[in-house]
Protein backbone atom coordinates (compact mmCIF):
# COMPACT_ATOMS: atom_id res chain seq x y z
CA UNK A 1 0.00 0.00 0.00
CA UNK A 2 1.25 3.54 -0.71
CA UNK A 3 2.54 5.48 2.26
CA UNK A 4 -0.02 7.83 3.83
CA UNK A 5 1.01 11.51 3.71
CA UNK A 6 -0.49 14.86 4.61
CA UNK A 7 0.52 18.40 3.74
CA UNK A 8 1.18 20.81 6.56
CA UNK A 9 3.13 23.81 7.78
CA UNK A 10 4.90 24.04 11.12
CA UNK A 11 5.32 26.98 13.48
CA UNK A 12 7.41 26.99 16.61
CA UNK A 13 5.88 27.85 19.99
CA UNK A 14 6.87 31.49 19.45
CA UNK A 15 4.81 31.46 16.24
CA UNK A 16 7.86 31.65 13.99
CA UNK A 17 7.33 30.15 10.54
CA UNK A 18 9.84 28.05 8.62
CA UNK A 19 11.12 29.18 5.23
CA UNK A 20 13.73 27.96 2.78
CA UNK A 21 16.81 30.10 3.38
CA UNK A 22 19.07 28.18 1.01
CA UNK A 23 18.86 25.23 -1.35
CA UNK A 24 19.39 22.85 1.61
CA UNK A 25 18.53 24.99 4.63
CA UNK A 26 15.49 26.15 6.59
CA UNK A 27 15.27 29.09 8.94
CA UNK A 28 12.64 30.35 11.37
CA UNK A 29 11.23 33.87 11.46
CA UNK A 30 8.00 35.71 12.10
CA UNK A 31 5.91 36.19 8.98
CA UNK A 32 2.74 38.15 8.46
CA UNK A 33 0.33 39.08 5.69
CA UNK A 34 1.32 38.04 2.19
CA UNK A 35 4.73 36.90 3.39
CA UNK A 36 3.00 33.88 4.99
CA UNK A 37 2.90 32.18 1.59
CA UNK A 38 6.70 31.96 1.80
CA UNK A 39 6.54 29.31 4.51
CA UNK A 40 7.62 25.81 3.68
CA UNK A 41 4.90 23.21 3.10
CA UNK A 42 5.85 19.77 4.38
CA UNK A 43 4.61 16.46 3.12
CA UNK A 44 4.50 14.47 6.34
CA UNK A 45 4.59 10.73 5.65
CA UNK A 46 3.60 8.15 8.22
CA UNK A 47 6.37 5.58 8.12
CA UNK A 48 7.48 2.36 9.75
CA UNK A 49 9.03 2.63 13.20
CA UNK A 50 8.47 2.28 16.91
CA UNK A 51 5.01 3.62 17.65
CA UNK A 52 2.97 4.38 20.77
CA UNK A 53 -0.10 6.45 21.67
CA UNK A 54 1.75 9.75 21.76
CA UNK A 55 4.73 8.88 19.55
CA UNK A 56 4.30 8.43 15.78
CA UNK A 57 7.19 7.90 13.33
CA UNK A 58 7.07 10.32 10.40
CA UNK A 59 9.27 11.57 7.57
CA UNK A 60 9.26 15.28 6.70
CA UNK A 61 9.58 15.94 2.99
CA UNK A 62 9.19 19.26 1.27
CA UNK A 63 6.03 19.14 -0.82
CA UNK A 64 6.78 18.94 -4.55
CA UNK A 65 10.52 18.97 -3.95
CA UNK A 66 12.73 15.89 -3.76
CA UNK A 67 14.04 17.01 -0.37
CA UNK A 68 13.68 15.42 3.06
CA UNK A 69 14.84 16.49 6.49
CA UNK A 70 17.46 14.04 7.64
CA UNK A 71 19.74 13.61 10.65
CA UNK A 72 23.42 12.78 10.12
CA UNK A 73 26.67 13.05 12.02
CA UNK A 74 28.78 16.01 10.96
CA UNK A 75 32.04 16.55 12.81
CA UNK A 76 30.78 13.99 15.35
CA UNK A 77 27.64 16.03 16.07
CA UNK A 78 24.06 15.06 15.15
CA UNK A 79 23.04 17.55 12.48
CA UNK A 80 19.81 18.39 10.66
CA UNK A 81 20.01 18.73 6.91
CA UNK A 82 17.84 18.79 3.83
CA UNK A 83 18.76 15.80 1.69
CA UNK A 84 17.99 15.30 -1.97
CA UNK A 85 16.43 11.93 -2.88
CA UNK A 86 15.39 10.07 -6.02
CA UNK A 87 11.68 10.85 -6.42
CA UNK A 88 11.07 7.44 -7.98
CA UNK A 89 11.82 5.77 -4.63
CA UNK A 90 10.36 8.25 -2.10
CA UNK A 91 8.32 8.49 -0.02
CA UNK A 92 8.22 4.88 1.10
CA UNK A 93 6.88 3.09 4.15
CA UNK A 94 10.29 1.85 5.27
CA UNK A 95 12.35 5.05 5.26
CA UNK A 96 16.01 4.97 6.22
CA UNK A 97 16.40 5.83 9.89
CA UNK A 98 18.08 9.20 9.24
CA UNK A 99 14.81 10.42 7.69
CA UNK A 100 12.59 9.29 10.56
CA UNK A 101 11.34 11.54 13.35
CA UNK A 102 9.22 10.54 16.30
CA UNK A 103 6.34 12.98 16.32
CA UNK A 104 5.50 13.39 20.00
CA UNK A 105 2.33 15.19 21.06
CA UNK A 106 2.33 16.82 24.50
CA UNK A 107 -0.31 19.36 25.58
CA UNK A 108 -1.34 20.15 22.00
CA UNK A 109 2.28 20.85 21.07
CA UNK A 110 4.46 18.68 18.85
CA UNK A 111 8.06 17.65 19.23
CA UNK A 112 10.08 15.94 16.52
CA UNK A 113 12.70 13.63 17.96
CA UNK A 114 15.30 12.12 15.67
CA UNK A 115 14.90 8.34 15.46
CA UNK A 116 18.58 8.09 14.58
CA UNK A 117 19.69 10.20 17.55
CA UNK A 118 17.31 9.78 20.53
CA UNK A 119 16.83 12.92 22.65
CA UNK A 120 17.83 15.17 19.74
CA UNK A 121 15.00 17.35 18.47
CA UNK A 122 14.18 19.62 15.56
CA UNK A 123 14.83 23.02 17.12
CA UNK A 124 14.71 26.74 16.47
CA UNK A 125 16.51 29.59 18.19
CA UNK A 126 14.84 32.28 20.25
CA UNK A 127 16.45 34.75 17.87
CA UNK A 128 14.80 35.70 14.61
CA UNK A 129 16.08 34.57 11.22
CA UNK A 130 18.26 31.69 12.42
CA UNK A 131 18.64 28.20 10.90
CA UNK A 132 16.43 25.32 11.98
CA UNK A 133 18.73 22.76 13.62
CA UNK A 134 18.95 19.53 15.59
CA UNK A 135 19.25 20.30 19.29
CA UNK A 136 20.21 18.01 22.13
CA UNK A 137 18.40 19.86 24.92
CA UNK A 138 14.73 20.23 25.73
CA UNK A 139 13.27 22.93 27.92
CA UNK A 140 16.30 25.19 27.60
CA UNK A 141 16.78 28.35 25.56
CA UNK A 142 16.12 26.68 22.23
CA UNK A 143 12.60 25.92 21.07
CA UNK A 144 11.55 22.30 20.42
CA UNK A 145 7.75 22.73 20.50
CA UNK A 146 5.76 23.21 17.31
CA UNK A 147 2.20 23.49 16.11
CA UNK A 148 1.02 21.98 12.86
CA UNK A 149 -1.33 23.58 10.36
CA UNK A 150 -2.97 21.36 7.75
CA UNK A 151 -2.74 22.44 4.12
CA UNK A 152 -5.11 21.16 1.44
CA UNK A 153 -3.39 19.18 -1.31
Amino acid sequence: APVRSLNCTLRDSQQKSLVMSGPYELKALHLQGQDMEQQVVFSMSFVQGEESNDKIPVALGLKEKNLYLSCVLKDDKPTLQLESVDPKNYPKKKMEKRFVFNKIEINNKLEFESAQFPNWYISTSQAENMPVFLGGTKGGQDITDFTMQFVSS
Partner: antibody, heavy 120, light 110 residues
Protein backbone atom coordinates in the same frame (compact mmCIF):
# COMPACT_ATOMS: atom_id res chain seq x y z
CA UNK B 1 4.26 48.71 -2.87
CA UNK B 2 6.82 46.17 -4.07
CA UNK B 3 9.42 47.71 -6.38
CA UNK B 4 12.68 46.56 -7.95
CA UNK B 5 15.05 48.78 -9.94
CA UNK B 6 18.27 47.62 -11.58
CA UNK B 7 21.20 49.92 -12.26
CA UNK B 8 24.85 49.76 -13.25
CA UNK B 9 24.53 48.70 -16.86
CA UNK B 10 26.34 50.37 -19.73
CA UNK B 11 29.10 49.92 -22.26
CA UNK B 12 32.04 47.80 -21.08
CA UNK B 13 35.16 46.57 -22.86
CA UNK B 14 35.73 42.84 -23.30
CA UNK B 15 37.67 41.45 -20.36
CA UNK B 16 36.31 44.11 -18.02
CA UNK B 17 34.13 43.74 -14.94
CA UNK B 18 30.81 45.18 -13.92
CA UNK B 19 28.65 45.22 -10.81
CA UNK B 20 24.92 45.53 -11.31
CA UNK B 21 22.63 46.58 -8.47
CA UNK B 22 18.99 45.83 -7.79
CA UNK B 23 17.39 48.15 -5.25
CA UNK B 24 14.24 46.72 -3.69
CA UNK B 25 11.47 48.22 -1.58
CA UNK B 26 8.21 47.02 -0.08
CA UNK B 27 9.57 43.68 1.19
CA UNK B 28 12.47 42.20 3.15
CA UNK B 29 15.49 40.39 1.71
CA UNK B 30 15.51 38.36 4.95
CA UNK B 31 12.25 36.76 3.81
CA UNK B 32 12.58 36.57 0.04
CA UNK B 33 15.11 34.93 -2.24
CA UNK B 34 16.08 37.00 -5.29
CA UNK B 35 17.07 35.98 -8.79
CA UNK B 36 18.97 37.44 -11.75
CA UNK B 37 17.87 36.64 -15.32
CA UNK B 38 19.33 37.96 -18.56
CA UNK B 39 18.10 38.31 -22.12
CA UNK B 40 20.42 38.74 -25.08
CA UNK B 41 19.05 40.85 -27.97
CA UNK B 42 16.35 38.88 -29.79
CA UNK B 43 16.85 35.83 -27.56
CA UNK B 44 14.98 34.12 -24.73
CA UNK B 45 15.22 34.41 -20.96
CA UNK B 46 18.32 32.90 -19.38
CA UNK B 47 18.43 32.23 -15.65
CA UNK B 48 21.70 33.25 -13.94
CA UNK B 49 21.10 32.33 -10.31
CA UNK B 50 19.64 33.05 -6.87
CA UNK B 51 20.70 34.82 -3.74
CA UNK B 52 18.74 32.97 -1.08
CA UNK B 53 17.19 34.73 1.90
CA UNK B 54 19.84 33.12 4.10
CA UNK B 55 22.64 34.64 2.03
CA UNK B 56 23.93 31.65 0.05
CA UNK B 57 23.90 31.73 -3.76
CA UNK B 58 22.93 29.14 -6.39
CA UNK B 59 24.02 29.50 -10.01
CA UNK B 60 23.13 28.12 -13.41
CA UNK B 61 25.80 25.60 -14.39
CA UNK B 62 27.12 27.92 -17.14
CA UNK B 63 27.32 30.92 -14.78
CA UNK B 64 29.57 29.38 -12.11
CA UNK B 65 32.89 31.17 -11.87
CA UNK B 66 32.42 34.50 -13.68
CA UNK B 67 29.17 35.52 -12.00
CA UNK B 68 28.74 36.35 -8.31
CA UNK B 69 25.43 37.23 -6.68
CA UNK B 70 25.41 38.91 -3.28
CA UNK B 71 23.22 41.20 -1.21
CA UNK B 72 23.27 43.84 1.49
CA UNK B 73 20.01 43.45 3.41
CA UNK B 74 20.61 46.67 5.35
CA UNK B 75 20.70 48.57 2.03
CA UNK B 76 17.84 46.54 0.51
CA UNK B 77 20.08 45.85 -2.46
CA UNK B 78 21.08 42.76 -4.43
CA UNK B 79 24.18 42.68 -6.61
CA UNK B 80 25.42 40.82 -9.67
CA UNK B 81 29.16 40.94 -10.28
CA UNK B 82 30.31 39.85 -13.76
CA UNK B 83 34.00 39.33 -14.46
CA UNK B 84 35.95 38.74 -17.70
CA UNK B 85 33.10 40.15 -19.76
CA UNK B 86 32.59 38.79 -23.28
CA UNK B 87 30.59 40.01 -26.26
CA UNK B 88 28.07 37.22 -25.60
CA UNK B 89 27.30 38.76 -22.19
CA UNK B 90 25.59 41.63 -23.99
CA UNK B 91 22.04 41.50 -22.70
CA UNK B 92 19.36 43.14 -20.61
CA UNK B 93 19.82 41.97 -17.02
CA UNK B 94 16.70 41.63 -14.87
CA UNK B 95 16.33 41.04 -11.17
CA UNK B 96 13.16 39.50 -9.79
CA UNK B 97 11.75 38.49 -6.43
CA UNK B 98 11.33 34.76 -5.89
CA UNK B 99 8.00 33.84 -4.33
CA UNK B 100 8.01 30.37 -2.79
CA UNK B 101 4.37 29.42 -3.10
CA UNK B 102 3.92 25.92 -1.64
CA UNK B 103 7.69 25.49 -2.12
CA UNK B 104 7.45 26.32 -5.84
CA UNK B 105 9.80 29.09 -6.99
CA UNK B 106 7.97 31.76 -8.99
CA UNK B 107 9.46 35.09 -10.18
CA UNK B 108 7.25 38.07 -9.34
CA UNK B 109 7.61 40.98 -9.75
CA UNK B 110 10.48 41.85 -12.10
CA UNK B 111 12.57 44.98 -12.40
CA UNK B 112 12.61 46.90 -15.70
CA UNK B 113 16.10 45.63 -16.50
CA UNK B 114 19.44 47.25 -17.21
CA UNK B 115 21.30 46.91 -20.52
CA UNK B 116 24.90 45.71 -20.55
CA UNK B 117 26.80 46.09 -23.83
CA UNK B 118 30.20 44.46 -24.16
CA UNK B 119 32.13 45.92 -27.06
CA UNK B 120 35.51 47.43 -27.86
CA UNK C 1 19.48 18.47 -14.64
CA UNK C 2 15.91 19.48 -15.51
CA UNK C 3 15.47 20.87 -19.02
CA UNK C 4 12.41 22.72 -20.25
CA UNK C 5 11.29 22.35 -23.86
CA UNK C 6 8.63 24.68 -25.23
CA UNK C 7 6.67 24.23 -28.44
CA UNK C 8 6.01 25.68 -30.89
CA UNK C 9 8.73 28.35 -31.01
CA UNK C 10 6.28 30.63 -32.82
CA UNK C 11 2.61 30.59 -33.77
CA UNK C 12 0.65 32.83 -36.12
CA UNK C 13 -2.91 33.48 -35.04
CA UNK C 14 -5.79 35.91 -35.45
CA UNK C 15 -7.79 37.84 -32.88
CA UNK C 16 -10.42 35.51 -31.42
CA UNK C 17 -8.38 32.35 -32.05
CA UNK C 18 -7.70 29.74 -29.41
CA UNK C 19 -3.95 29.39 -28.89
CA UNK C 20 -2.22 26.49 -27.12
CA UNK C 21 1.44 26.47 -26.05
CA UNK C 22 3.12 23.38 -24.65
CA UNK C 23 5.97 22.98 -22.22
CA UNK C 24 7.69 19.72 -21.36
CA UNK C 25 10.05 19.05 -18.46
CA UNK C 26 12.77 16.43 -18.83
CA UNK C 27 11.77 15.02 -15.44
CA UNK C 28 8.80 15.21 -13.12
CA UNK C 29 8.22 18.67 -11.63
CA UNK C 30 4.80 18.02 -10.05
CA UNK C 31 2.83 21.28 -10.41
CA UNK C 32 6.00 23.38 -10.26
CA UNK C 33 5.52 25.42 -13.42
CA UNK C 34 4.92 29.10 -14.10
CA UNK C 35 4.08 30.98 -17.31
CA UNK C 36 5.23 34.51 -18.19
CA UNK C 37 4.26 36.98 -20.89
CA UNK C 38 6.81 39.40 -22.33
CA UNK C 39 6.23 42.20 -24.81
CA UNK C 40 9.13 43.74 -26.79
CA UNK C 41 11.31 46.03 -24.67
CA UNK C 42 9.35 45.22 -21.50
CA UNK C 43 9.92 43.12 -18.39
CA UNK C 44 8.32 39.67 -18.18
CA UNK C 45 5.00 39.46 -16.36
CA UNK C 46 3.80 36.48 -14.34
CA UNK C 47 0.62 34.96 -15.78
CA UNK C 48 0.19 31.57 -14.11
CA UNK C 49 1.90 29.81 -11.21
CA UNK C 50 1.68 26.30 -9.77
CA UNK C 51 0.71 25.14 -13.29
CA UNK C 52 -2.87 26.39 -13.18
CA UNK C 53 -3.30 29.30 -10.74
CA UNK C 54 -3.96 32.64 -12.41
CA UNK C 55 -1.79 35.49 -11.11
CA UNK C 56 -3.52 38.59 -9.78
CA UNK C 57 -5.05 40.78 -12.49
CA UNK C 58 -4.58 38.26 -15.32
CA UNK C 59 -7.65 37.89 -17.58
CA UNK C 60 -9.57 34.62 -17.35
CA UNK C 61 -9.00 33.86 -21.05
CA UNK C 62 -5.59 32.61 -19.93
CA UNK C 63 -5.48 29.16 -18.36
CA UNK C 64 -2.83 26.63 -17.46
CA UNK C 65 -3.02 22.88 -17.07
CA UNK C 66 -0.84 19.83 -16.58
CA UNK C 67 1.35 18.24 -13.94
CA UNK C 68 4.35 15.96 -13.85
CA UNK C 69 6.19 16.61 -17.10
CA UNK C 70 3.62 18.00 -19.56
CA UNK C 71 2.03 21.43 -19.29
CA UNK C 72 -0.13 23.66 -21.44
CA UNK C 73 -0.91 27.37 -21.59
CA UNK C 74 -4.16 28.18 -23.37
CA UNK C 75 -5.47 31.55 -24.53
CA UNK C 76 -9.15 30.87 -25.18
CA UNK C 77 -9.84 33.91 -27.39
CA UNK C 78 -6.76 35.84 -28.48
CA UNK C 79 -6.94 39.61 -27.96
CA UNK C 80 -4.76 42.26 -29.67
CA UNK C 81 -2.81 42.83 -26.44
CA UNK C 82 -1.91 39.13 -26.23
CA UNK C 83 0.56 39.23 -29.12
CA UNK C 84 3.78 38.67 -27.19
CA UNK C 85 6.34 36.00 -26.29
CA UNK C 86 5.43 33.43 -23.63
CA UNK C 87 7.89 31.52 -21.44
CA UNK C 88 7.47 28.58 -19.10
CA UNK C 89 9.65 28.20 -15.99
CA UNK C 90 10.18 25.26 -13.67
CA UNK C 91 10.23 26.17 -9.99
CA UNK C 92 11.22 22.89 -8.39
CA UNK C 93 15.02 22.73 -8.60
CA UNK C 94 17.91 25.18 -8.86
CA UNK C 95 20.68 22.59 -8.56
CA UNK C 96 22.81 21.72 -11.61
CA UNK C 97 20.45 23.58 -13.92
CA UNK C 98 21.35 25.26 -17.22
CA UNK C 99 18.15 27.26 -17.47
CA UNK C 100 14.87 27.20 -15.56
CA UNK C 101 13.07 28.68 -18.59
CA UNK C 102 11.75 27.15 -21.76
CA UNK C 103 12.92 28.65 -25.05
CA UNK C 104 9.85 30.84 -25.50
CA UNK C 105 6.89 30.93 -27.90
CA UNK C 106 6.24 34.03 -29.96
CA UNK C 107 2.56 34.62 -30.73
CA UNK C 108 2.38 36.66 -33.94
CA UNK C 109 -0.43 38.21 -35.94
CA UNK C 110 -1.50 36.08 -38.88
Amino acid sequence: EVQLVESGGGLVQPGGSLRLSCAVSGFSLDVYTMTWVRQAPGKGLEWIGYIWSGGSASYASWAKGRFTISKDSSKNTVYLQINSLRAEDTAVYFCARVKMISNIETFDPWGPGTLVTVSS
Amino acid sequence: DIQMTQSPSSVSASVGDRVTIKCQASERIYSGLAWYQQKPGKRPKLLIYRASTLASGVPSRFSGSGSGTDFTLTISSLQPEDFATYYCQQGVSSSDIDNVFGGGTKVEIK
